[in-house]
Interface confidence: low
């Protein structure tokens, strides 16, 4: 008979014959022959293969490198890779999350518009007129100036984007 030119699903063509692929979690040791089936071996610890394959080497699990701010979110198995995520207080520097950096703080005069997440940095906004922030923080929003009037006081010193207003007593001498 003519040798096959294509093989069924989960098979591969070698030396004019169809051999079974190795299942996920196993690597190829030797191809099948006329007399023997494909020989496969389980991946070692810290290795994986996630598809039906004819790979002679398993892939190393991804290393969640603490120097890059990464930690293990989900431990890998013989069939799945390790999933990394950023340490708390850090966020990914790219969509692939191959490294992380510390959430930035908003400087005095700026408040937090959006608190950082594991995948996005802190978003800061300038404190508008009537609001201030006197701290460098990754959490604090701009605070409204104190309302002197509601306390029956007057403004003694105007507020800025970095300082609150200073209230003082009404001038008793005025009519």
């Amino acid at each position: 008979p003519e040798p096959p030119t294509a093989c069924r699903e989960k098979q591969y063509l070698i030396n004019s014959q169809c051999c079974s692929l190795c299942q996920p979690g196993q690597k190829l040791v030797s191809d099948c022959t006329e007399f023997t089936e494909t020989e496969c071996l389980p991946c070692g610890e810290s290795e994986f293969l996630d598809t039906w394959n004819r790979e002679t080497h398993c892939h190393q699990h991804k290393y969640c490198d603490p120097n890059l701010g990464l930690r293990v979110q989900q431990k890998g198995t013989s069939e799945t890779d390790t999933i990394c995520t950023c340490e708390e207080g850090w966020h990914c520097t790219s969509e692939a999350c191959e490294s992380c950096v510390l959430h930035r703080s908003c400087s005095p005069g700026f408040g937090v518009k959006q608190i950082a997440t594991g995948v996005s940095d802190t978003i800061c906004e300038p404190c508008p007129v009537g609001f201030f922030s006197n701290v460098s923080s990754a959490f604090e929003k701009c605070h409204p100036w104190t309302s002197c009037e509601t306390k029956d006081l007057v403004v003694q010193q105007a507020g800025t984007n970095k300082t609150d207003v200073v209230c003082g007593p009404q001038d008793r001498l005025r009519a």
Partner: antibody, heavy 119, light 112 residues
């Protein structure tokens, strides 16, 4: 003002042990920094020894430092310690405490503490 | 692990002039830009000047400029002043699963 200060250096005999302490002032470990130890032999370059993630306590060691050096932290005291054992003359150096907030860049350093290993 | 090779010491610079120090890595640094530069004066700890190859650290004068990518990096100091006399170190982070951190051997800058 953010500062780091090392202590615990001094003269120690070969095969001896020493524990160095780094005190952080002006910032909290809950701010999620890496705290590291770097050393510098007299007249030589810089060498990273070990780091600890101040928030979770996860550690990293240079391969040559594994086994003889142990890094740990105390969040309540805002300190990082480096325990050194089986010291040799080659460990004579100034030991610096340094902080990293990402990109493997050290933005804050202590003045250093000198460790001399000699008989 | 990567080996970082710096311009041999000492390098001479004239006040008001420009000086460049090179740093060559035996392997590409992480993301092609995870390289930093430090200034160290005798009896003092290193001071961060540049990180991510070209980003100026807080409080560092813009006379200091970092450039380069992959394996070749340069620190350039323009309008040199006497206070720039120091030893300069590059530091790179190469890759996971290795002793990825490496410091260069240092380059001494002498200001005349």
């Amino acid at each position: 003002q953010q500062q780091l200060e090392e202590s615990g250096g001094g003269l120690v005999k070969p095969e001896g042990s020493l524990t160095l302490t780094c005190k952080a002032n002006g910032f909290s470990f809950s701010a999620n920094y890496y705290m590291c130890w770097v050393r510098q032999a007299p007249g030589k370059g810089l060498e990273l020894i070990a780091c600890i993630y101040a928030s979770s306590g996860s550690t990293w060691y240079a391969s040559w430092a594994k086994g003889r050096f142990t890094i740990s932290k105390s969040t309540s005291l805002n300190t990082v310690t480096l325990q050194m054992t089986s010291l040799t003359v080659a460990d004579t150096a100034t030991y610096f405490c340094a902080r990293s907030g990402g990109y493997a860049a050290y933005d804050l350093w202590g003045p250093g503490t000198l460790v001399t290993v000699s008989s | 692990a990567a080996v970082l090779t710096q311009t041999p010491s000492p390098v001479s610079a004239a006040v008001g002039g420009t000086v460049s120090i090179s740093c060559q890595s035996s392997k590409s640094v992480y993301n092609n830009n995870w390289l930093s530069w430090y200034q160290q004066k005798p009896g003092q700890p290193p001071k961060l000047l540049i990180y991510r190859a070209s980003t100026l650290a807080s409080g560092v004068p813009s006379r200091f400029r970092g450039s380069g990518s992959g394996t070749e990096f340069t620190l350039t100091i323009s309008d040199v002043v006497c206070d720039d006399a120091a030893t300069y170190y590059c530091a790179g982070y190469e890759s996971v699963n290795t002793d990825g951190h490496a410091f260069g051997g240092g380059t001494e800058v002498v200001v005349k």
